[in-house]
Structure formats: C-alpha cells, structure tokens
C-alpha cells in the first residue's frame, strides 16, 4: 500500500471535467468572513516530476524523503493559490484548465475543477484553507481512468448480424449499476431486456441487428462512491 492510498479517492475520466471536492466544516456563524479566505491547492503527482514553470519555482519546503512504504516521490507543486483578495497564482501550464468557483468559495466550497482532467493530473492533492481565525485542510487522491465502448465484432455490420457491445472504465472495482440507452432525436431512450436486447453486467448483446439499430448507443456506469461515466458508441448497420 503506497502512502496516500488511505486518503479519500476521487475518480475521474480522462478528458472529462473533474471535481476535487473540498468543503470543510467551517465553524463560523458569519459566512461573510469567507470573503477573506485563502486557499492553496497542492499536487503530488503519482509519477514523473512536474516540470517547473519558468518564473514559478516550486514551493519552498523540505524535499520529501522517500516515504516509509514507497519509493522516491516527485516534487509537489502549487496548482492554484487564491489569496484573500481573490488574487490568483499557480503553475502556468495548468492555469487555463484549473478553476475555483468564486461563488462556491464564498459558501465555503473550495473544490478544485480540472477542465478537462489529464492523465498527469493523477496523484495526491491537498488544499489548505486559511480563514480569518483558523486553518483547515482537505486531502484526496485523484485517480484517472479511461472509458471505452467496444463492439465485437468491430466495424460495420450487416442486417441479421449479431454484436456484443462492452462498456468499460479502467477502474478495479465493478460498477454498482450499468444503464444502457439509445440517443434518439427526443433524447435518451433506455434500453430494456427484450428478445432484441440481452443485458449482462457491462455487456449488451444484440442477436440480430437491423438498419434501425444504426446510430449512437450509450451506457452509464455508476460506482458505489457515486462516480459515474457515460460512454457512447456509434453503431453502423448496412441495409
């Protein structure tokens, strides 16, 4: 078990927006004091040290030694820092992708948004929240997965062919639920078990396709922690 594995884990899909939640319990009656709050988000990448942005040296502090149950760690760096006046600083390559919701901050929600999340964003995150009279922190580990839908056999199909669609997300635990749907003009239409559609966990078996089956098919994988991912596949059935 590598250090940091014990902190809450947040999953995100590569290429999709990711929310790194931070809403610490703020023992304040007067929420107006939050306007003076400052927050600093730090990232300790899983592997491969981040390149220091020119003119933005890495934050001072100890060079972390090898953790007691893991190998050497890449240097941590400041993703984003928002001072009491809303003044922002952070690592340049990340800046356009990194957001804090200003209205959320004034309600005590210091969540960090990555739009979109990339593979290099995986790792441990810490938020230090400085209030007028106290300091609070949030810690989490961001894991990134890839979503895919595959068809077997692949490629274009002919009428009366069979096909199996497999919906997957690269996460070790199994989804708590899988919902299949079709995208029609009027929106999403759920796919139910029938002689034409056989559902088994993350698989959808169509024993005899027809040109009517052409078009986008989708699945939603939902995990026990509430994380869900929607995946689309465009099926082509020749007449």
């Amino acid at each position: 078990l590598q250090p940091g594995a014990e902190v809450p884990v947040v999953w995100a899909q590569e290429g999709a927006p990711a929310q790194l939640p931070c809403s610490p319990t703020i023992p304040l009656q007067d929420l107006s004091l939050l306007r003076r709050a400052g927050v600093t988000w730090q990232h300790q990448p899983d592997s491969g040290p981040p390149a220091a942005a020119p003119g933005h040296p890495l934050a001072p502090g100890p060079h972390p030694a090898a953790p007691s149950s893991w190998g050497p760690r890449p240097r941590r760096y400041t993703v984003l820092s928002v001072g009491p006046g809303g003044l922002r600083s952070g690592r340049l390559p990340l800046q356009p992708r990194v957001q804090l919701d200003e209205r959320g901050r004034q309600r005590g929600d210091f969540s960090l948004w990555l739009r979109p999340a990339r593979r290099a964003d995986a790792g441990e995150y810490r938020a230090a929240v400085h209030l007028r009279d106290r300091a609070l922190s949030c810690r989490l580990r961001l894991r990134l997965g890839q979503a895919s839908m595959t068809a077997s056999p692949p490629g274009s199909l002919r009428a009366s062919d069979w096909v199996i669609l497999n919906c997957s997300f690269s996460r070790p635990d199994r989804p708590a639920s899988v919902h299949w749907f079709r995208n029609r003009g009027q929106g999403r239409v759920p796919v139910r078990e029938s002689p034409h559609h056989h559902l088994a966990e993350s698989f959808l078996f169509l024993p005899q396709v027809s040109p009517m089956d052409s078009g986008p098919w989708g699945c939603i994988l939902t995990y026990r922690d509430g994380f869900n991912v929607s995946i689309m596949y465009n099926l082509t059935v020749l007449g």
Partner: antibody, heavy 120, light 107 residues
C-alpha cells in the same frame, strides 16, 4: 546549516510582559511559515502561534489569544513572540519552529528553546 | 479542537525489539499526522509526516502508518539511542495539537 536560535528573558512576574526572539539562518526565512510551540514542565507540547510566509494569516491557540502577538521581520530573518498578561500556566520551554509549508502544518525545524518562568 | 491521545505514557523495550506506539485522533484527520522524537535534553525532531512519509535523513527503522483516526509509529529494531519521548501531532487543521507523548525506555 539550518538553525533557529531563541533568546529572551527567562523569569517574569505574573501579569508581566516578555518578548522572545528567534534568529533564523541557513534557509530563506521569508519563504517559510513559522510557529511557536511550547513544552510545559510536564513535557506536554502545545502549539502557541503561527504566521504564514507573507504574514497574510496569523493564528493563535485559544489559551494565548489576546495576550500573545507573533510577528516576523524578513529583513532581519527574525521571528518574535510578544507575551503580555503572563500567567503561571505560561511557564514552559518556548520553541521557535519552521513550518514545512504554508499549507502543510508540521514542524520540520526546531530551535534550541527559550525557558520562560512566570513566578512571583 | 482535535484531541490526540497516546494511550501509553511509558513503553519498555529491549535493544533489537520491534516496538509500536499508537495515537488516536478524536476526529478524522485523513493522513495528516506527524511523529516527533525528543531525546533527553534536546529539542523535538521531526521523523514522520503525513502519517507515513519519512523526513529527510531519518533512519528507515522508523515507519508510520494509519489513516482517519488511528495511527501507529513503529521502530523495527530498537537501538539504545532510541531512548526518547515520542509525540504524535495532527497537521490537519488549527489549532494543531499533539499527543501527550510516549516515553520509550530501554530495558
């Protein structure tokens, strides 16, 4: 060599005042948050006060709030603790400490300590 | 305030033994716990931070583990120079608080 050296008068009467200084060397003082931590005669450690690297945020333990003032002089590389309305329960060894990061609040460098005795 | 409790004030061990010191937080501090060693007549010294990361230059005989509310500090093979007071500290939120300390005695 990273060093923190505290200085200040060690014996004071109840109700009196005292100013502790901490001279820092061997690191970029202005880049670090700093803190004071005290150790009671019973060997209990108590965090006392904290100041961020830029001085934007200052925090105190409830037991000293309103009586103690932490400050820093980044030109002189010195941390201060102004103590007033001293009580016998403030008797302790006072350590100047470096905070690992402004946002990671453990103490990675400790001074040699300054003994403070509040007694009539 | 978060209360850090070290249940053993004293622990007696022999050279070469493995010894574990425990610390319990009154509320979830994720992995924000540090461990310090204070030898007689000296200032405290940081050994472990963020529950399981060894500080620069600290011997690999010292390890830390735990998350949430329960934390453990272990010395894999006790040496005579390990005679000291050991403190845990939560660095999750202010006020930053310490455990009462565990004095390690060598038989």
């Amino acid at each position: 060599d990273v060093k923190l050296v505290e200085s200040g008068e060690d014996l004071v009467k109840p109700g009196g005042s005292l100013k502790l200084s901490c001279a820092a060397s061997g690191f970029t003082f202005s880049s670090y948050a700093m803190s004071w931590v005290r150790q009671t005669p019973e060997k209990r450690l108590e965090w006392v006060a904290y100041v961020t690297s830029g001085g934007d945020y200052i925090y105190y333990a409830d037991t000293v709030k309103g009586r103690f003032t932490i400050s820093r002089d980044d030109v002189r590389n010195t941390l201060y603790l102004q103590m007033s309305s001293l009580k016998s329960e403030d008797t302790a060894m006072y350590y100047c400490t470096r905070v690992a990061y402004d946002y990671e609040w453990y103490f990675d460098v400790w001074g040699t300590g300054a003994p403070v005795t509040v007694s009539s | 305030d978060i209360v850090m409790t070290q249940s053993h004030k004293f622990m007696s061990t022999s050279v070469g033994d493995r010894v574990s010191i425990t610390c319990k937080a009154s509320q979830d501090v994720t992995t924000a716990v540090a461990w310090y060693q204070q030898k007689p007549g000296q200032s405290p010294k940081l050994l472990i931070y963020s529950a399981s990361y060894r500080y620069t230059g600290v011997s690999d005989r010292f390890t830390g583990s735990g998350s949430g509310t329960d934390f453990t500090f272990t010395i894999s093979s006790v040496q005579a120079e390990d005679l000291a007071l050991y403190y845990c500290q939560q660095h999750d939120s202010s006020p930053w608080t310490f455990g009462g300390g565990t004095k390690l005695e060598i038989k």
